[in-house]
């Protein structure tokens, strides 16, 4: 699982790439995306 902290501090990533990784994680974990 990828934590929000890890994602937000992953430098050099586009905002869409962060959304992409969040969404892929959401599809697996069913966390709320809002």
């Amino acid at each position: 699982a990828v934590s929000e902290h890890q994602l937000l501090h992953d430098k050099g990533k586009s905002i869409q790439d962060l959304r992409r990784r969040f969404f892929l994680h959401h599809l697996i974990a069913e966390i709320h995306t809002a």
Partner: antibody, heavy 118, light 115 residues
Framework: QVQLVESGGGVVQPGRSLRLSCAAS????????MSWVRQAPGKGLEWVAT????????YYPDSVKGRFTISRDNSKNTLYLQMNSLRAEDTAVYYC???????????WGQGTLVTVSS | QLVLTQSSSASFSLGASAKLTCTLS???????IEWYQQQPLKPPKYVMD???????STGDGIPDRFSGSSSGADRYLSISNIQPEDEAMYIC?????????????FGGGTKVTVL
């Protein structure tokens, strides 16, 4: 190894319904989001629907929203696509696909052909 | 509007290097995309995801002859020492989540012929 086998395709008249199935094996089905992607004869790919691992969240493009419903039965390791009010433009090979932690459509089935014609 | 543009076809000599281009709509130039290979009469196969900085992760069973790179809104798929089995349609795709809705679009694909 990951295996996805689609079934349920065939010839159907415009306005009628059809339900596709995708039998999954070789992985823990309940742990991954699943999708349907279609390809009209001689045309490109079009994303049709996505469902989360437990089935709580579903996503559709405007072209099928309100007509198609994606669902899953994790006890049967099976993904479904209920297609209502079918149109000629829905004629396509329908593929099911499995996500990974890295990408949306990492593994694909062989596809099932749906022909909408009177 | 999220759009991917690909040239329709390209031909390469056996053993040559090939470079295919997928261009994002200008306002989406930072986006991560995916590349897929579809051999004739077969389902698509995931090749790689390709980020803005050119970093990429390849799918299962993809030879290391396949690599990716990026420049601005362009995303490149390179094939070194191209082989007969590489003759296929190569399709790029991109997804995004907007207001809790998911969208995913594919490019039209580039048909690669190996001479």
């Amino acid at each position: 190894q990951v295996q996805l086998v689609e079934s349920g395709g065939g010839v159907v008249q415009p306005g009628r319904s059809l339900r596709l199935s995708c039998a999954a094996s070789g992985f823990t089905f309940s742990s991954y989001g699943m999708s349907w992607v279609r390809q009209a004869p001689g045309k490109g790919l079009e994303w049709v629907a996505t469902i989360s691992s437990g089935g709580s969240y579903t996503y559709y493009p405007d072209s099928v929203k309100g007509r198609f419903t994606i669902s899953r039965d994790n006890s049967k390791n099976t993904l479904y696509l209920q297609m209502n009010s079918l149109r000629a433009e829905d004629t396509a090979v329908y593929y099911c696909a499995r996500q990974t932690t890295m990408t949306y459509f990492a593994y694909w089935g062989q596809g099932t052909l749906v022909t909408v014609s009177s | 509007q999220l759009v991917l543009t690909q040239s329709s076809s390209a031909s390469f000599s056996l053993g040559a290097s090939a470079k295919l281009t997928c261009t994002l709509s200008s306002q989406h130039s930072t986006y991560t995309i995916e590349w897929y290979q579809q051999q004739p009469l077969k389902p698509p196969k995931y090749v790689m995801d390709l980020k803005q900085d050119g970093s990429h992760s390849t799918g299962d069973g993809i030879p290391d002859r396949f690599s990716g790179s990026s420049s601005g809104a362009d995303r490149y798929l390179s094939i070194s020492n191209i082989q007969p089995e590489d003759e296929a349609m190569y399709i790029c795709g991109v997804g995004d989540t907007i207001k809790e809705q998911f969208v995913y679009v594919f490019g039209g694909g580039t048909k690669v012929t190996v001479l």
